[in-house]
Amino acid sequence: DSSKWVFEHPETLYAWEGACVWIPCTYRALDGDLESFILFHNPEYNKNTSKFDGTRLYESTKDGKVPSEQKRVQFLGDKNKNCTLSIHPVHLNDSGQLGLRMESKTEKWMERIHLNVSERPFPPHIQLPPEIQESQEVTLTCLLNFSCYGYPIQLQWLLEGVPMRQAAVTSTSLTIKSVFTRSELKFSPQWSHHGKIVTCQLQDADGKFLSNDTVQLNVKHTPKLEIKVTPSDAIVREGDSVTMTCEVSSSNPEYTTVSWLKDGTSLKKQNTFTLNLREVTKDQSGKYCCQVSNDVGPGRSEEVFLQVQYAPEPSTVQILHSPAVEGSQVEFLCMSLANPLPTNYTWYHNGKEMQGRTEEKVHIPKILPWHAGTYSCVAENILGTGQRGPGAELDVQYPPKKVTTVIQNPMPIREGDTVTLSCNYNSSNPSVTRYEWKPHGAWEEPSLGVLKIQNVGWDNTTIACAACNSWCSWASPVALNVQYAPRDVRVRKIKPLSEIHSGNSVSLQCDFSSSHPKEVQFFWEKNGRLLGKESQLNFDSISPEDAGSYSCWVNNSIGQTASKAWTLEVLYAPRRLRVSMSPGDQVMEGKSATLTCESDANPPVSHYTWFDWNNQSLPYHSQKLRLEPVKVQHSGAYWCQGTNSVGKGRSPLSTLTVYYSPETIGRR
């Protein structure tokens, strides 16, 4: 209802003499801030005075003064929402009702809180799950309805009076909803914990005992069993008798059924605590145990290993591994069922006893082809000697042996010949299934192990073959030693380095990259004419007439090879200059005359100079000198000079005659 003040706090708080009480509290006043607060002990309303009577434990007024006796009780709240209280220490006679008298400017309220103070520390309470089963983790809870900031406590767990090893988790609550201290312990009980006493002990900060709670554990578990056997070592010979007894040492709840198992399988019609085995056979060897069940489940005893002893049975040989690769290691294992285990072995290879081999295993570190064959063995123990079994076959595999590449052709081989090679070997296991050849080529294999090289190349130097089964064995390479005519013949200028100038000494070299056989002859030719038979062609002083197309030939006993034609070019100054005249050397005045400076030069003439009969240079620099109209005064001797980058050349004089025209003669 909106006319009420709203308070939140625990309904009742618990403590004991000498401890303390912390009262968490919140409130909301109807209007404004709190102006006055009185804490009463067991307040009663006086109708006459319209006030509350009772012991005043705490009082706060507008001036904020607090009497000195109020130090034990503290109001830790404020004027609008917090009403937390603390009583330290708390006494037995503090039990009862606490009344919080609150006054604001216009409203008043009395809030009641119950306080239960006992004479001595009250015990905590242990809470257990409804059922505890062995090896299933459970949480044990110890709860105490007390917590106070001014009075630290601790909760300790004990099993049969001894502190428990497991770590407990302690939590405290001091809220308006609840005040408590709680300890939780996670614990996996074993069947041996059944009936044991668990204690939760309340202690003060110094570990002094204050109170405790105890419970007895009821741990549900499968039956716990012990097995006994006669004879005690459980070792017998065929035909002996054996007795086994099953005893229950603990079961919760009580057991219901009994059975016996051999090698994990239930024995039929054996439902008593005693198992009698008469005239045992070797098949009865094995691991025995008894099984007893209750509502939790079946419990099993430890296993008893019953050994029925007998002489070795016929043996078999196991080979690790067959087929074996030559050079690898092989282990032979003699397998014979016997009890006790055989103490001595005899080994046979192809029916012949292997000397010095008496162990269960025979190890051959490096297998060779002669190790192949049948291996058998005989086992022996204290009860007798077994029989020799059928044995096992060792197959020793190895790469082809002594592989060779053989040339079938008559020697020598010439470039372009068809060469046939065969790949031979001595022995192989498994059989040779294929052959490989090096280097690879687009070659024919007309039959297995035969290689045919059509049109053999000059550079086919060596060939190797491999015979292959599971592995390939390579033969040493065989040299084909192919003979061929000289290759890559070319003309190379040795001197000069660059352009050949007229007068230079010139050396041309006839080069070739290879020849087989090595012995060669050289031939030089120009325009089909033989010039020399040395590797070099030398010109002491070259002239323009030596220019032209040169070739060299290199031959050996297989054939001859020509170089590409090599053009020899000679640079020279202009020569053979002459002045030609058109239309002729006699021209009528008034007509036109053209003088041309003809020359032979390399590089071509780039600059011409014309001179007259007085050796006066004329202002013309092209190859043609054109006189138009020609005059009689032009008559005379002319010469020209040609210049290229090498030098100059001059022509002899050429005379031009200009005669008068009929008109001129007529005028005279």
């Epitope: 660059s498 352009e499 100038h501 230079n504 000494s505 600059h607 290229n644 980058s645 030098g647």
Partner: antibody, heavy 113, light 107 residues
């Protein structure tokens, strides 16, 4: 192998004449031309002239009035003479076979008073 | 005189890079052109003559091409020892003239 070596005065006063000798080994001057090329400091190459195996010469037109090239085949020597020197004739002077097949290491000329 | 215009005047290149230097003649020189390499403090060395003919002993990464007025020198894959100044020389027309040079440096 072919080797060329220039020898010159190093320092010459302006208006004076320059004479440089190029000594050739490894080939005959009867058969080969010798060119002269110069290179001013930090600049490019300039062709000056050539004397051929037969003794004929060819000079750069810009220097024709100041330059003369001669040789002594028996001593395998070629001579360059440059008259009326100016400061811009300062350069390294090289001799070379034909038009640069083989070069001498050069001789440095400084024209300064 | 024939003027030989060489370009670029200088260039920086990385090892392994392809490098091309060009020379342009002011008139047709008929492939009468050679290329020279000069290293600092050394005399020039001939590499190529007649525009495209490689001198014996010069590495094959050097090649020359061109005709008429336009010519070029190419280094297919630059090596450290190729640093220096490169000159072209025309000898087709008197007087012989060199290009101004191309300085090749490592980037």
């Amino acid at each position: 192998q072919v080797q060329l070596k220039e020898s010159g005065p190093g320092l010459v006063a302006p208006s004076q004449s320059l004479s440089i000798t190029c000594t050739v080994s490894g080939l005959s001057l009867n058969n080969y031309g010798v060119s002269w090329v110069r290179q001013p400091p930090g600049k490019g190459l300039e062709w000056l002239g050539v004397i051929w195996g037969d003794g004929s010469t060819n000079y750069h037109s810009a220097l024709i009035s100041r330059l003369s090239i001669s040789k002594d085949n028996s001593k395998s020597q070629v001579f360059l003479k440059l008259n009326s020197l100016h400061t811009d004739d300062t350069a390294t002077y090289y001799c070379a076979i034909n038009w640069g097949d083989y070069w001498g290491q050069g001789t440095t000329l400084i024209v300064s008073s | 005189d024939i003027k030989m215009t060489q370009s670029p005047s200088s260039m920086n290149a990385s090892l392994g890079e392809r490098v091309t230097i060009t020379c342009k003649a002011s008139q047709d020189i008929n492939s009468y052109l050679s290329w020279f390499q000069q290293k600092p403090g050394k005399s020039p060395k001939i590499l190529i003559y007649r525009a495209n003919r490689l001198i014996d002993g010069v590495p094959s990464r050097f090649s020359g091409s061109g005709s008429g007025q336009d010519y070029s020198l190419t280094i297919s894959s630059l090596e450290y020892e190729d640093m220096g100044i490169y000159y072209c020389l025309q000898y087709g027309v008197f007087p012989l003239t060199f290009g101004a040079g191309t300085k090749l440096e490592l980037k």
